[in-house]
Amino acid sequence: DISEPPLHDFYCSRLLDLVFLLDGSSRLSEAEFEVLKAFVVDMMERLRISQKWVRVAVVEYHDGSHAYIGLKDRKRPSELRRIASQVKYAGSQVASTSEVLKYTLFQIFSKIDRPEASRIALLLMASQEPQRMSRNFVRYVQGLKKKKVIVIPVGIGPHANLKQIRLIEKQAPENKAFVLSSVDELEQQRDEIVSYLCDLAPEAPPPT
């Protein structure tokens, strides 16, 4: 297992599959998108990333989804952070939460290969998809619930889809939402978000 020494006092050593879903719409300027990526990298520094402990995936979504890191990628944590920092700014007109949740359901968590680990999708959203694209939104959220995938929406700024955030929260008590007025609040909320995710994941059983 490729591991590196912890970078911070708080370090989440749990069994967790965590997917970061980044809004690639023009509702975020490129500068704001850079702050969003920095937040993801900062979070990754606080996780014990390895195939045994915390596995991460990073997906940028617009009208489709672009995976930069997969859960099974066997790379050093520092290399995974570097890749996360390389996510390109799409600045597209649309960022479809329905499409990215569908992608999370049918691509990332199609097969549950670590049933002992918690599964969490951190949905970073700053925009609203057109209504025509959101027809199956609830179906995908329910599908994720069936697969025991916790969805944690982080609404950022005035254009985040509060209706969808509330729908996600309604599906399961663990689906706690964080609603921020701008990307500037991400750093303030980071430790609370990491702690919340970490508390949802089980500790490794003691060696027998």
Epitope: S26, A31, V35, A38, R82, V87
Partner: nanobody
């Protein structure tokens, strides 16, 4: 190969203003200013993005420093107002071709100028 040349530094009294300029010899993506106070590490000041002109400024200088660019002239500027002795440093212009590294880390930037000294006296 991009070359960056800074100008506009100097000695100024506390509360004063300065405008730093950076001339780029080739095409750049994001352009940033960093500074290195005496005996300290180089730190992020501000960045501007070519795609949409959006900017980020370090919390320590927000409301006092503004970054701007003139794409036609391949120039980037740092307008500094209400200067404090703590702003004394060598100011560097930097540019990036890609995305690797967070916006505030020096590793993100491929090209660097030689620096221009800014001294703020009390």
């Amino acid at each position: 190969q991009v070359q960056l040349v800074e100008s506009g530094g100097g000695l100024v009294q506390a509360g004063g203003s300065l405008r730093l300029s950076c001339a780029a010899s080739g095409r750049t993506k994001d352009m940033a200013w960093f500074r290195q106070p005496p005996g300290k590490e180089r730190e992020f000041v501000a960045v501007i993005y070519s795609s949409d002109g959006s900017t980020l400024v370090a919390a320590s200088v927000t409301g006092r420093f503004t970054i701007s660019r003139d794409n036609a002239k391949n120039m980037v500027y740092l307008q500094m107002t209400s200067l404090k002795p703590a702003d004394t440093a060598v100011y560097y212009c930097a540019s990036s071709r890609g995305y690797s590294g967070t916006y505030y880390s020096t590793s993100r930037y491929d090209y660097w100028g030689q620096g221009t000294q800014v001294t703020v006296s009390s």
